[in-house]
Amino acid sequence: MLSHTGPSRFALFLLCSMETLLSSHMAPTHQLPPSDVRKIILELQPLSRGLLEDYQKKETGVPESNRTLLLCLTSDSQPPRLNSSAILPYFRAIRPLSDKNIIDKIIEQLDKLKFQHEPETEISVPADTFECKSFILTILQQFSACLESVFKSLNSGPQ
């Protein structure tokens, strides 16, 4: 595992950006029906999984980061919905460093889930090559896990 002693500027930046995301959550202006959300999730799952598996093959031995936390589920809806506004900046940030075609398809689907007028913060990718790879891997893993959470929730009755 990657271990870090003391706070880094990158870690502090992430914490600040996450606080901004949480505090700037605006009221939705439209709500997609669960059937449409499900279609989008089904579109995203193979894209996300393929991207993750390709990256793991290409970057063997890169550990996941303990410092990167993708707040990918909203905290105010039942069933859970993807927090598209929180996720999109990460994919825009890693787009130049990964498979642009697949990421463009993911961004296209996430845009459909995004509520109007929701602000997006800008995300900086770490400059250090190793930290950067770890950052990308963690985003892809957490995004895949979030899709699975939403998928299972949509398959289940009310909890």
């Epitope: 595992m1 999730i41 089904l42 579109e43 995203l44 799952q45 193979p46 999984r49 993750l52 996941e64 980061s65 303990n66 936390l69 707040l71 990918c72 589920l73 909203t74 905290s75 859970p80 963690t138 893993q141 957490q142 895949s144 896990a145 979030c146 699975e148 959470s149 998928f151 299972k152 929730s153 398959n155 289940s156 909890q159």
Partner: antibody
Framework: EVKLVESGGGLVKPGGSLKLSCAAS????????MSWVRQIPEKRLEWVAT????????YSADSVKGRFTISRDNARNTLYLQMSSLRSEDTAVYYC???????????WGQGTLVTVSA | DIVMSQSPSSLSVSAGDKVTMSCKSS????????????LAWYQQKPWQPPKLLIY???TRESGVPDRFTGSGSGTDFTLTISSVQAEDLAVYYC?????????FGGGTKLEIK
């Protein structure tokens, strides 16, 4: 190395309460959904509850709904199960488990025994 | 809730034998989006916690010997052990990972003659 260590089990009277903990190490705890699964000795496995990676959503079996609460502290890498109004049928070994990326519970703790008896 | 049924409940075989066990779900576990079946197989040896053997119905977890093979799709699944070893003595469970509540089969107890 991924490690999950449960604690907090023991003997409790019907109607009593108990809080189980699961200390996680060797992986990015905050990235994974976590679950509790129980097993009555020599019997089948029964899923108890799951909590999403950020802790915002929880799911639980009908048999424990309203009595058991799953929670997590990502800063402490710890999963919890608060059990109240315990019944004799809650007697079991309780395992904490980490969700695989797609399908299955990839890692399990050794379990902690909860015995509900007068 | 999805009901998981396993058969047989127990079987006794000799070392080197080929073994198959079945798991049926009351509804399809196939995700049409990623074409994955949300079914997992676990091995539980005496006095140990369960261990993930197979996920996605057919993908072996890393470190699992290749004598273990998972197959099937939708509602019918099979776990095959091509040549049983003494250390395979265990109870094998299948699990629905498609929706909450997660449900497990009753298990197949494998005994070595």
């Amino acid at each position: 190395e991924v490690k999950l260590v449960e604690s907090g089990g023991g003997l409790v009277k019907p109607g009593g309460s108990l809080k189980l903990s699961c200390a996680a190490s060797g992986f990015a705890f905050s990235s994974y959904d976590m679950s509790w699964v129980r097993q009555i000795p020599e019997k089948r496995l029964e899923w108890v509850a799951t909590i999403t990676s950020g802790g915002g959503y929880t799911y639980s079996a009908d048999s424990v709904k309203g009595r058991f609460t799953i929670s997590r502290d990502n800063a402490r890498n710890t999963l919890y199960l608060q059990m109240s109004s315990l019944r004799s049928e809650d007697t079991a070994v309780y395992y904490c488990a980490r969700q695989n990326w797609v399908v299955g519970l990839a890692y399990w703790g050794q379990g902690t025994l909860v015995t509900v008896s007068a | 809730d999805i009901v998981m049924s396993q058969s047989p409940s127990s079987l006794s075989v000799s070392a080197g034998d080929k073994v198959t066990m079945s798991c049926k779900s009351s509804q399809s576990l196939l995700n049409s989006g990623n074409q994955k079946n949300y079914l997992a197989w676990y091995q539980q040896k005496p006095w140990q916690p369960p261990k993930l053997l197979i996920y996605g119905a057919s993908t072996r977890e890393s470190g699992v010997p290749d004598r273990f093979t998972g197959s099937g799709s939708g509602t019918d699944f099979t776990l095959t052990i091509s040549s049983v070893q003494a250390e395979d003595l265990a109870v094998y469970y299948c699990q629905n990972d498609y929706s909450y509540p997660y449900t497990f089969g009753g298990g197949t107890k494998l005994e070595i003659k």
